[in-house]
């Protein structure tokens, strides 16, 4: 066992001479992003104050390619890198095409309306006039490709004029536009060469030891890894913590059960019920507030102030009133919960599916004519599953090196 331990320690650290270095640099696991849209069935009725009705469409599946670049080894046992992602649509795995039309809330109009609720009435009336002139409505009919990767919208120019410096988009707006062909920030993580106990843990993200999106030191902490590998020799008492640039926060998953993936022993980690709980139910989350119902997290502070919320798909594990407020939602543990299956000896993921939902809080706002009589509601826009499983040659090598060899050595 000590020989095995030495082999593991030698081969998991971030070091060009280690076995897992290339695996860390260019993840050989095929990752897929499966996106499900909530097609709004009754936009006119919602504007009259009726309950929203949605229909899930999808999945629209993309192969996700990741590669690390600008890899720089520092002299404090850390390495800095940028990880780029590109997405390629997979028609054969998808239920529909990127040219499918989806009726969706107009995030720019409805987001701007909520953001301007407490602004002077004059500004709101100017916005109404502008929205009318520009033909901007509360709901839009756009293709999957446009929603994902961006569409030209004159409202982007208008928002940049009236709210300068707040909006990360120029000319085009798309929900996943910032992810494609771009990096998720400069990560600096510990290599484990000098101190294996800190391996993969994030030292800094974009040069920061903590973020400032939230209202408490605890919520602003950058904890855990960058979300791809974890320290070795896990136990059922271990937790799986990582910093997510997309959620602008650290997340902690808990051990659920032991299992086997393709002959390799694994630990399954899942989201605790408290992950998106509000501050009154789980006080440590108070720093993520102001909160609405429990089970959704306000990400407006890191998403250009738009009233966007993150949760489990279909408001799974959230306050039931959220799913009841929208016809067509059916939360289901099997279909909508996230998991990561980790090989506990190495801390390397074997099989994972991270599922999250993005929703928009919308309501009628006095002075913004386009909001009609919309009753306050958190309306799901889409949910996605980012999934990957080790396979092929990589799996074979992994099984041989880390399951078969130790067994042989043991005997």
């Amino acid at each position: 066992p000590s020989l095995i331990k030495q082999q593991v320690l030698k081969n998991v650290r971030i070091d060009p001479s280690s076995l897992s270095f290339n695996m860390w640099k260019e993840i050989p696991i095929p990752f897929y992003l499966s996106v499900y849209f909530f097609d709004v069935m009754n936009p006119s009725e919602i504007l009259k104050g009726e309950k929203p009705q949605v229909r899930e469409r999808g999945p629209y599946v993309y192969r996700e390619f990741r590669h690390k670049s600008n890899i720089t080894f520092n002299n404090n046992d850390t390495v800095s890198f940028l990880e780029y992602r590109t997405f390629q649509f997979q028609p054969s795995k998808s239920h529909g095409s990127e040219s499918d039309y989806i009726v969706m809330p107009n995030i720019l109009v409805l987001g701007a309306a909520v953001m301007m609720e407490n602004k002077p009435m004059t500004l709101k009336l100017i916005m109404t006039l502008a929205f009318t002139t520009l033909g901007e409505r509360a709901f839009m009919n756009r293709t999957v490709g446009e929603i994902m990767w961006g569409y030209k919208d004159p409202l982007v120019n208008l928002i940049n004029k009236y709210f300068p410096g707040m909006f990360p988009f120029k000319d085009k707006f798309g929900l996943f536009a910032e992810l494609n062909n771009s990096d998720s920030g400069l990560f600096t993580v510990f290599t484990g060469v000098q101190n294996i106990s800190r391996i993969h843990l994030v030292d800094k993200w974009n040069g920061l030891s903590k973020v400032d999106f939230w209202h408490s030191d605890q919520c602003n902490m950058i904890n855990g890894t960058s979300g791809q590998m974890w320290p070795p020799f896990m136990t059922p008492e271990s937790s799986l913590e990582f910093y997510s640039p997309e959620a602008c926060r650290s997340m902690k998953l808990m051990y659920k059960e032991s299992g086997v993936f393709e002959g390799i022993p694994t630990y399954r980690f899942v989201a605790p019920k408290t992950l998106f709980a509000n501050g009154s139910i789980y006080p440590p989350n108070e720093g993520f507030c102001p909160c609405l119902e429990s089970g959704i997290q306000n990400v407006s502070t890191c998403r250009f102030s738009a009233p966007l919320f993150l949760s489990h798909p279909h408001f799974l594990n959230a306050d039931p009133v959220l799913a009841e407020a929208v016809t067509g939602l059916h939360p289901n543990q099997e279909a909508h919960s996230l998991f990561l299956d980790i090989h506990p000896v190495t801390g390397i993921p074997m099989n994972c599916s991270v599922k999250l939902q993005l929703s928009l809080y919308m309501k009628s706002v006095a002075g913004i004519g386009q909001t009609g009589k919309i009753e306050p509601v958190v309306l799901p826009l889409l949910w996605f599953a980012e999934s990957g499983a080790m396979e092929g040659e990589t799996l074979h090598t992994f099984y041989t090196q880390l399951v078969l060899m130790p067994k042989v050595m043991h005997y």
């Epitope: 936009p43 006119s44 504007l47 009435m121 009336l125 100017i126 109404t128 006039l129 502008a130 009318t132 002139t133 520009l134 033909g135 901007e136 409505r137 509360a138 709901f139 004159p154 120019n157 208008l158 004029k161 006095a366 002075g367 004519g369 386009q370 009609g372 009589k373």
Partner: antibody, heavy 119, light 108 residues
Framework: EVQLVQSGAEVRKPGTAVKISCKVA????????IYWLQQAPGKGPEWMGL????????IYAEKFQGRVAITADTSTDTAYMELSSLKSEDTAVYYC????????????WGQGTLVTVSS | VLTQPPSASGAPGQRVTFSCSGS????????VNWYQQLPGAAPRLLMH???QRASGVPDRFSGSKSGTSASLAITGLQSEDEADYFC???????????FGGGTKLTVL
């Protein structure tokens, strides 16, 4: 479907004021913002101001600021536009218009009211 | 603020194009609407968001934009198309919509 019905033609002397009405029919008055536009002979329309009848909030174009007052009477489903200190160049057709909720642009217009300013 | 030629003409069945010239604070940054005004009538929304036909408008009408200019095209010209055509856009510097002076179309 919403319709806008305006009051009849008016003749005024310079320096006086005129008040035009615009009645909303076919739908709930307070669901619609009402816009007022001026169209001088041989010219394109010019936006003057708007009102949200729900709470009588208004904004006006800089050109007409101080001379125009837009009001709404929810008991009669009617919006009004009053233009004061009239000059001969105010001779024009005045339109009320709206955008039916969920539509784009000014897609519903009143029939127009001709105001002639002459001494 | 938006400049349109005062007149245009075409024979029935022909194609006619109207131009509308603006600046970076209006057409250059935002979408364009087109209105049709028949003699003695109120303007009627014809095209919105540059290239989208308003409800009930036949597909003989089409709109486009390039840089700080926009255009409206009518194919298969008909006598009932004889009217004034106005372009409109949001203007940044005026915080309001601006209209062109209009182009009078005569069907020969």
């Amino acid at each position: 479907e919403v319709q806008l019905v305006q009051s009849g033609a008016e003749v005024r002397k310079p320096g006086t004021a005129v008040k035009i009405s615009c009645k909303v029919a076919g739908d709930t008055f307070t669901d619609y913002f009402i816009y007022w536009l001026q169209q001088a002979p041989g010219k394109g329309p010019e936006w003057m101001g708007l009102i949200d009848p729900k709470d009588a909030q208004t904004i006006y174009a800089e050109k007409f600021q101080g001379r125009v007052a837009i009001t709404a009477d929810t008991s009669t489903d009617t919006a009004y536009m009053e233009l004061s200190s009239l000059k001969s160049e105010d001779t024009a057709v005045y339109y009320c218009a709206t955008d039916s909720v969920g539509s784009a642009g000014f897609d519903v217009w009143g029939q127009g009211t001709l105001v002639t300013v002459s001494s | 603020v938006l400049t349109q030629p005062p007149s245009a003409s075409g024979a029935p069945g022909q194609r006619v194009t109207f131009s509308c010239s603006g600046s970076g604070s209006n057409i250059g940054s935002y979408t364009v609407n087109w209105y049709q005004q028949l003699p003695g009538a109120a303007p009627r929304l014809l095209m919105h968001t540059t290239d989208q036909r308003a409800s009930g408008v036949p597909d003989r009408f089409s709109g486009s934009k390039s840089g700080t200019s926009a255009s409206l095209a009518i194919t298969g010209l008909q006598s009932e198309d004889e009217a004034d055509y106005f372009c409109a856009a949001w203007d940044d510097s005026l915080d309001g919509p601006v209209f062109g002076g209009g182009t009078k179309l005569t069907v020969l």
